[in-house]
Interface confidence: medium
């Protein structure tokens, strides 16, 4: 709390202008006035305040308005964002996609912090679901946001925003996330033609089911080891050997290197030995030639 | 963090000339602008001048005209050239960098404008 003081003669502030920096933080706190402040919050950004006098100048903002700052201020804030809580941000109301890109501007560069992850909240909350616009921002300026979502608030993301998302936005998904955004880039991408489909639906592909696989395996697509790697392994299972062949094309070589990993390790005990040996990879441990391979699964579901 | 180590100061009689530097390390790509401030004997602090990263100089009415501020981004170097020093200019100056998302500071130089 800044001890109130009167302002010395003659330095009362007529405007936020350069003049400011050489006030003592008890100077701003008696000589600027907040009304004054506020609506010129445009300039401060353009002034080279310390941190010191920030906090003076946020502290006349929040005495000017306790239930929170109006949008008319909020856009303007610059780098002052960097010193409000997140306590502060909730009392906000963002609608502007302009006001969000300003603050996210003043953060760049750094991770996200506490108080852009409230900004985000709020705004998307405001908006009710994360449209494409907001989505393209988002991911711009932080690349993992996508995947700091849960699956919950991934649901509200809609089909038309998933043209926004980058491969690399996927990257920390994991394939709960997944199983969420690959029905929605599935319908996203649905009027493309097979070979521009699949470099778009590729990075979706581990929230993919057996069916889908399937299906691309009918397409030529040549799915590298990478995105196969990254596949659930309840939809790899499934699949013969014949139609992993297809999906891989010349990648399935590929296969023998990641013999020991899943979903690979799993998938080649459900083969029989015969089938993998077509591939002339040397892959070992399928069922052995003879021997009679039970569904439980598809007996449960008879009984 | 940000580190900031001042030189150059020391005993100049008056209507001499001193450069100081301050070399700021660390995570320097943070730093939104910097200056010098400075603190004359029994005296509070008192901002001498600033430079933003873009270049944008600004003086305190007492040292127009006399001192010059300017930084060196390929050494990550700050300097104030002071001309014309007076016995009132007689001070310790500390660099001070406002940087993501906090103030840093020097440990200070100290400059004596004495016959």
């Known amino acids: 709390e800044v001890e109130k003081t009167a302002c010395p003669s003659g330095k009362k502030a007529r405007e936020i202008d350069e003049s400011l920096i050489f006030y003592k933080k008890w100077e701003l706190e008696a000589c600027v006035d907040a009304a004054l402040l506020a609506t010129q919050m445009d300039r401060v950004n353009a002034i080279p305040f310390t941190y010191e006098q920030l906090d003076v100048l946020k502290h006349k903002l929040d005495e000017l308005y306790p239930q929170g700052y109006p949008e008319s201020v909020i856009q303007h804030l610059g780098y002052l964002f960097l010193k409000m809580s997140p306590e502060d941000i909730r009392k906000w109301n963002v609608t502007s996609l302009e006001t969000l890109k300003a603050l996210l501007e003043v953060n760049k560069g750094h991770e996200m912090s506490p108080q852009v992850a409230t900004l985000i909240d709020r705004f998307v909350k405001g908006r009710g679901q994360l449209d494409k616009d907001t989505l393209d921002t988002l991911t711009a300026f932080y690349p993992g946001y996508l995947c700091s979502l849960s699956p919950e608030e991934l649901s509200s993301v809609p089909p038309s925003s998933i043209w926004a998302v980058r491969p690399q936005d996927l990257d920390t998904c994991d394939p709960r996330q997944l199983d969420v955004l690959y029905p929605k880039a599935r319908l996203a991408f649905q009027n493309m033609n097979g070979s521009e489909y699949f470099v778009k639906i590729q990075s979706f592909l581990g929230g993919a089911p057996t069916e889908d696989l399937k299906a691309l395996s009918q397409q030529n697509v040549s799915m590298d080891l990478a995105t196969f790697m990254k596949l659930r392994t309840d939809a790899v299972l499934p699949l013969t050997v014949a139609e992993v062949q297809k999906l891989l094309g010349p990648h399935v070589e590929g296969l023998k290197a990641e013999e020991r990993h899943r979903p690979v390790r799993d998938w080649i005990l459900r083969q029989r030995q015969d089938d993998l040996d077509t591939l002339g990879l040397g892959l070992q441990g399928g069922i052995p030639n003879g021997y009679l391979v039970l569904d439980l699964s598809m007996q449960e579901a008879l009984s | 963090e940000v580190q900031l180590v001042e030189s150059g100061g020391g005993l100049i009689q008056p209507g001499g000339s001193l450069r100081l530097s301050c070399a700021a390390s660390?995570?320097?790509?943070?730093?939104?602008?910097m200056g010098w401030v400075r603190q004359a004997p029994g005296k509070g602090l008192e901002w001498v001048s600033t430079?933003?990263?873009?270049?944008?100089?600004y003086y305190a009415n007492f040292v127009k005209g006399r001192f010059t501020i300017s930084r060196d981004n390929s050494k990550n170097t700050l300097y104030l050239q002071m001309n014309s020093l007076r016995a009132e200019d007689t001070a310790v100056y500390y660099c001070?960098?406002?940087?993501?998302?906090?103030?840093?500071w020097g440990q200070g130089t100290l400059v004596t404008v004495s016959s």
């Open positions: 660390g995570n320097i790509g943070s730093i939104r602008h």
């Open positions: 001070r960098a406002t940087a993501h998302p906090t103030d840093y």
């Open positions: 430079i933003t990263t873009v270049g944008t100089t």
